[in-house]
Amino acid sequence: GSERTCCPVNWVEHERSCYWFSRSGKAWADADNYCRLEDAHLVVVTSWEEQKFVQHHIGPVNTWMGLHDQNGPWKWVDGTDYETGFKNWRPEQPDDWYGHGLGGGEDCAHFTDDGRWNDDVCQRPYRWVCETELDKASQEPPLL
């Protein structure tokens, strides 16, 4: 495939990545799938600078990111290492709260109204952010 050099229409470019901000809500798995179908992934936050950028665009609204612990360890969807990477949890989070009564704990991470992170039930229909890197090869076949 060819290398992507500019962002698709309706995506926002920032620091060699493209971002798409939803205005509707989906469960985490559906949001994850939506981004994959766009040859992207749920946003992976790797720095305070990127955190502030995303926070500015989403406003004070619960919004899914590409971080989950559905199989035990916290994992970023693009393979970025959680342990050594940027973190911005709210105080006392993540807490894997069981008190919601929906079964299980809380396995998916989202931006809260102040931008800091919380873990929540993955089925909740929150907004989401997709991200794709400009320097990665596109899945589209090259023009002949």
Epitope: Q70, G72, Q93, G99
Partner: antibody
Framework: EVQLVESGGGLVKPGGSLRLSCAAS????????MNWVRQAPGKGLEWVSS????????YYADSVKGRFTISRDNAKNSLYLQMNSLRAEDTAVYYC????????WGQGTLVTVSS | DIQMTQSPSSLSASVGDRVTITCRAS??????LAWFQQKSGKAPKSLIS???SLQTGVPSRFSGSGSGTDFTLTISSLQPEDFATYYC?????????FGGGTKVEIK
């Protein structure tokens, strides 16, 4: 590499007390709920207690409620189980395990309650 | 409390055999089911989470399936190192509960 190492087991008389510790390394301890699980000799696995990442939520099995206290120190990457009023039926290998699906386990520490 | 019933409690099999262990929950557990392998004198090892997701490093001959209340652990071709005791566990709600275990022995 995730590592969990239990200590503090031993022989104690009925009615006595013991404090177990679990030293965690290789992961961001403060991001994970932790648990104690036990196994009596020749028996199956029994969940004992859970504690959330910042100690906000704590749960106990009915068999230990009021006698055992789970706690953690995130600054020291350590999990604890204070066991009071011990009974013969508390004799078991005690394991610490990460998160509620127990993805990593320590090697266990043996607690024997006998007169 | 959710009761977890495992069957059989023990089975004898040969290397290369396909082995199936079942676990039934007393009520729906939303696929919050894990499987563990425990060898004699050792700590349990996590094999599967959310009913069917293989944990990192677990051989692909292990698989999990099921939903609702009925779940299955399958070993497609039993290897010598697979002779052990297997446990299921629900983490849908507290108290967290285990099945009674299934001991897989050499025929």
């Amino acid at each position: 590499e995730v590592q969990l190492v239990e200590s503090g087991g031993g022989l104690v008389k009925p009615g006595g007390s013991l404090r177990l510790s679990c030293a965690a390394s290789g992961f961001t301890f403060s991001s994970y709920n932790m648990n104690w699980v036990r196994q009596a000799p020749g028996k199956g696995l029994e969940w004992v207690s859970s504690i959330s990442s910042s100690s906000s939520y704590i749960y106990y099995a009915d068999s230990v409620k009021g006698r055992f206290t789970i706690s953690r120190d995130n600054a020291k990457n350590s999990l604890y189980l204070q066991m009071n009023s011990l009974r013969a039926e508390d004799t078991a290998v005690y394991y610490c395990a990460r998160v509620n699906l127990f993805d990593y386990w320590g090697q266990g520490t043996l607690v024997t309650v006998s007169s | 409390d959710i009761q977890m019933t495992q069957s059989p409690s023990s089975l004898s099999a040969s290397v290369g055999d396909r082995v199936t262990i079942t676990c039934r929950a007393s009520q729906g557990i939303n696929n919050y089911l894990a499987w563990f392998q425990q060898k004699s004198g050792k700590a349990p090892k996590s094999l599967i989470s959310v009913a069917s997701s293989l944990q990192t490093g677990v051989p692909s001959r292990f698989s999990g399936s099921g939903s609702g209340t009925d779940f299955t652990l399958t070993i497609s071709s039993l290897q010598p190192e697979d002779f052990a005791t297997y446990y299921c566990q629900q983490y849908n709600s507290y108290p967290l509960t285990f099945g009674g275990g299934t001991k897989v022995e050499i025929k």
